[in-house]
């Protein structure tokens, strides 16, 4: 199997999501990139860039914000304002088509918890669960892209390929992913 | 525990270059990026870029593009920072620092001890 | 390009409470976080994500925001936090404060 450590964030109300996502370059130069939330049995991709890419641009739908890296592999996403509901699983994936796309490694379980963003925390531990996926065929994945500029909303989707460097994991049942803990 | 080990102290003449290396251990190297900060006598802290070990991708500083590289050898989980064309500005303290998670560029928790780089004729 | 201001010194007596101010454009909406710096030391993360301490940082440091200005908080300070202390967010680079030289009377 493969096994997919998870990184938990701990926010109060009002604060903002900060997250980058790494990525291949080469294969995906004009791929759309999204960000998603696990939800119930599907994915939902909560934004998304457009084709074609353009110098890096960030690109706004709502409270979320996507900024590419163009020359580093490099995704940057922001949700500012956080609410207790935004908690749960999130992951940034490359889109390629309405059927397919490619997890980029770490998935992100978000806890958001009421009271002032101005109190002082304590330390967290980053990783926190360990997610297991059936095990598959590897394909390498190259290094080079340019960068989105407009972003859309998108239904859920229902077949994912899970992406790390060096390998895939095509999953033609979405729960396979999903079916995790998600607080500790 | 995670550690950072720069090299030792350079001094160099005005117009040569230099090479600080980082070697990590405590962790996976690929996983995590690797930024440099410098400081310079009586000036604050000043970042002039990050590598990904995992690509070897590198993203610097508008001020120090063009004469600054940074490079890894994965093979002895080694970073390095070189700069070329210096002059007596560059005399600084050279920092290697982690990101504290994969998913986040800052903030950096992990810090080496630092390498004095003297420029002078 | 993206600037993080600080105030170049505070002051404070022993035993009182020492603030130090980051201002920057939308930097409600970044995560913050704070160094210190002493003399011949490697600087040391004292907050990150705007109010989160890591482990082994005294509780009397603490971070907190105000719209754009994020503030570092030392209560209760000790001579031993005499240091110069950094702000810090990304903004497409990672970009520091000036610095704020801390002096405990």
């Known amino acids: 199997t493969t096994e997919l450590t998870e990184e938990k964030y701990e926010y109060k109300e009002g604060q903002t999501l900060e997250v980058k996502c790494d990525y291949a370059l080469e294969k995906y130069a004009n791929s759309r990139k999204a960000w998603q939330k696990m939800e119930g049995k599907m994915p939902k991709i909560l934004a998304k860039t457009e084709r074609p890419s353009e110098n890096s641009h960030p690109v706004q739908v709502g409270r979320i914000t996507l900024e590419d890296y163009p020359d580093h592999g490099l995704l940057q996403v922001r949700m500012t304002n956080l609410q207790v509901e935004d908690s749960g699983l999130y992951q940034c994936v490359i889109y390629q088509h309405p059927k397919e796309s490619h997890v980029l490694f770490n998935p992100i379980c978000l806890v958001v918890t009421k009271g002032s963003s101005g109190t002082p925390g304590s330390s967290e531990n980053s990783t926190q669960n360990v997610y297991r996926t059936p095990s598959t065929t590897a394909k390498a994945l190259g290094p080079r892209y340019t960068s989105p500029r407009t972003v859309t909303q998108a239904p859920p989707e229902s077949t994912v390929v899970v992406s790390t460097p060096g390998s895939e994991i095509n999953l033609t049942n979405v729960t396979d992913i999903i079916r995790v803990p998600v607080f500790n | 525990q995670v550690q950072l080990v720069q090299s030792g102290a350079e001094v160099k003449k005005p117009g040569a270059s230099v090479k600080v290396s980082c070697k990590a251990s405590?962790?996976?190297?690929?996983?995590?990026?690797i930024h440099w900060v410098r400081q310079a006598p009586g000036q604050g802290l000043e970042w002039m870029g990050w590598?990904?070990?995992?690509?070897?991708?590198?993203n610097y500083a508008q001020k120090f593009q063009g004469w600054v590289t940074m490079t890894r050898d994965t093979s002895i989980s080694t970073a390095y920072m070189e700069l070329s064309r210096l002059t007596s500005d560059d005399t600084a303290v050279y920092y290697c620092?982690?990101?504290?998670?994969?998913?986040?560029?800052?903030?950096?928790?992990?810090w080496g001890q630092g390498t004095l780089v003297t420029v002078s004729s | 390009s993206y600037e993080l201001t600080q105030p170049p010194s505070v002051s404070v007596s022993p035993g009182q409470t020492a603030s130090i101010t980051c201002s920057g454009d939308?930097?409600?909406?970044?995560?913050v976080c704070w160094y210190q710096l002493k003399p011949g030391q490697s600087p040391i993360l004292v907050i990150y994500?705007?109010?989160k301490r890591p482990s082994g940082i005294p509780e009397r440091f603490s971070g907190s925001k105000s719209g754009n200005t994020a503030i570092l908080t030392i209560s209760g300070t000790q001579a031993m936090d005499e240091a110069d202390y950094y702000c810090?967010?990304?903004?497409?680079?990672?970009?520091f404060g000036g610095g704020t030289k801390l002096t405990v009377l």
């Open positions: 994500q705007d109010n």
């Open positions: 939308k930097l409600g909406e970044r995560n």
């Open positions: 810090q967010a990304w903004d497409r680079n990672v970009v």
């Open positions: 620092a982690r990101d504290q998670r994969k998913t986040t560029v800052t903030p950096f928790e992990y």
């Open positions: 590598l990904n070990p995992n690509s070897g991708g590198a």
């Open positions: 405590g962790y996976t190297f690929n996983g995590y990026y």
